[in-house]
């Protein structure tokens, strides 16, 4: 969490941002809140990015003002116009690109004063893994697949029964470049698995950590997946 205060001139207002990550090719949110004003027409929201000459986005007098927008962000940004009045200056970024990563500034002007806060935005690709029993294999084998990751993640297998065991000798992980030549499909195979055990396939890079669990018994197979974004710090 980053909390920024205003500078010179009028009184300062508090602006708060939260570091976040964007999944390339999908839409992302750059979070920013501020002390609200009673009049929408008095609120100016400006988003800037380090390394970019023009503005990322500008909202003033109750509407988007895009004449100063940098071409890099054209057609890809929007604020939540109906929530500005309650102090939400968050930016929706469409079709996140790898190059969108960097330092952003949320700059606010209201009748109470000015304030700003920086936000670190990471970009990459992350997806939920799915673990399945590979019935085609000669021995009991599990196959963990996740369709989109970037940068290249690490894959670690764990088991509930053999806690702390190192499965690197009995697993094989491959990374296959997807058609857009950035993200990769992750496939990891675990050999010599035993029945009545829960196995976890953990995929992690510096942006996200995802886990796919599978519990194999003689009568059923249970699966569970979850994904967690790393380093979500507020400013």
């Amino acid at each position: 969490l980053i909390i920024g205060f205003g500078i010179s001139g009028r009184h300062s207002i508090t602006v708060t941002t939260v570091a976040s990550a964007g999944n390339i090719g999908e839409d992302g949110i750059l979070s920013c809140t501020f002390e609200p004003d009673i009049k929408l027409s008095d609120i100016v929201i400006q988003w800037l990015k380090e390394g970019v000459l023009g503005l990322v986005h500008e909202f003033k007098e109750g509407k988007d003002e895009l004449s100063e927008q940098d071409e890099m962000f054209r057609g890809r940004t929007a604020v939540f116009a109906d929530q500005v009045i309650v102090g939400n200056a968050s930016l929706r970024l469409k079709n996140v690109q790898l190059t969108d990563a960097g330092t952003y500034k949320c700059y606010i002007i209201t009748s109470k004063g000015k304030g700003n806060a920086n936000l670190e935005y990471k970009t990459g690709a992350f997806s939920m893994p799915e673990v399945n029993v590979d019935y085609n294999a000669s021995s009991e084998t599990l196959r963990c697949e996740a369709p989109r990751w970037f940068p290249q993640p690490t894959v670690v297998w764990a088991s509930q029964v053999d806690q702390g065991a190192n499965f690197s000798e009995v697993s094989n992980t491959s990374f296959e470049l997807n058609s857009e030549n950035v993200t990769m499909k992750v496939v990891s195979v675990l050999y010599n698995v035993t029945i009545n055990n829960t196995y976890s396939c953990m995929i992690e890079n510096d942006i996200a950590k995802a886990t796919g669990d599978i519990k194999v018994t003689e009568s059923e197979i249970k699966r569970r997946s979850h994904l967690q974004l790393l380093n979500s710090k507020a400013s």
């Epitope: 800037l48 390394g51 970019v52 000459l53 023009g54 503005l55 004449s67 927008q69």
Partner: antibody, heavy 115, light 113 residues
Framework: QVQLVQSGAEVKKPGSSVKVSCKAS????????INWVRQAPGQGLEWMGG????????RYAQKFQGRVTITADESTSTAYMELSSLRSEDTAVYYC????????WGQGTLVTVSS | DIVMTQSPDSLAVSLGERATINCKSS????????????LAWYQQKPGQPPKLLIY???TRESGVPDRFSGSGSGTDFTLTISSLQAEDVAVYYC?????????FGQGTRLEIK
């Protein structure tokens, strides 16, 4: 009301450098780009480059790359344009202009390059 | 870079008459998603910096008299002064702000006939 006030006229020798300043008042200095545009005598307008004062990010027209340096000092709301290796064809009026859409302009600074 | 070409280079029009200046861009400055043309017109009087008249190809800047109007889309644009006044004698420039580097037309000098 936004005002941009530039430094005074300069006479320079070929091969030397010139540094022109542009001080902003009456508005938010840091968030809009400050651009530099030059106009040779009797000629048109030519964009040289610009800077985002908040982050110090500068972009230059290819023609001036390596010869121009644009900087900004947030504390004094002042932008600077330095042009090096001056030649006679650099004799021009140099303007600072605020924003990608140049809504506000400085009064211009005449730089004369003569031996 | 986008090249902006204005025509004519100079123009003489009688007071009260219509003046028309054309501007052509080497590539489209229309962004289809928002249907906006990133094209502006400036007026420059002798010894003064340019003054923004029109942006988004047809939106008048605040304080600009309504005798000034802009039209066109894509690559072809026009600045029209419906009834020329003595104070309109100046050089007029079109500018694209669609991409960096920002580029200007070579200018059109408008005089009274």
């Amino acid at each position: 009301q936004v005002q941009l006030v530039q430094s005074g006229a300069e006479v320079k020798k070929p091969g030397s450098s010139v540094k022109v300043s542009c001080k902003a008042s009456g508005g938010t200095f840091s968030t809009y780009a400050i651009n530099w545009v030059r106009q040779a005598p009797g000629q048109g307008l030519e964009w040289m480059g610009g800077i985002n004062p908040m982050f110090g990010t500068a972009r230059y027209a290819q023609k001036f790359q390596g010869r121009v340096t644009i900087t900004a000092d947030e504390s004094t709301s002042t932008a600077y344009m330095e042009l090096s290796s001056l030649r006679s064809e650099d004799t021009a009026v140099y303007y600072c202009a605020r924003g990608r859409l140049h809504r506000h302009w400085g009064q211009g600074t005449l730089v004369t390059v003569s031996s | 870079d986008i090249v902006m070409t204005q025509s004519p280079d100079s123009l003489a029009v009688s007071l009260g008459e219509r003046a028309t200046i054309n501007c052509k861009s080497s590539q489209s400055v229309l962004y289809s998603s928002n249907n906006k043309n990133y094209l502006a017109w400036y007026q420059q009087k002798p010894g003064q910096p340019p003054k923004l008249l029109i942006y988004w190809a047809s939106t008048r800047e605040s304080g600009v008299p309504d005798r000034f109007s802009g039209s066109g889309s894509g690559t072809d644009f026009t600045l029209t002064i419906s009834s020329l006044q003595a104070e309109d004698v100046a050089v007029y420039y079109c500018q694209q702000y669609y991409t960096t580097p920002i580029t200007f037309g070579q200018g059109t000098r408008l005089e009274i006939k």
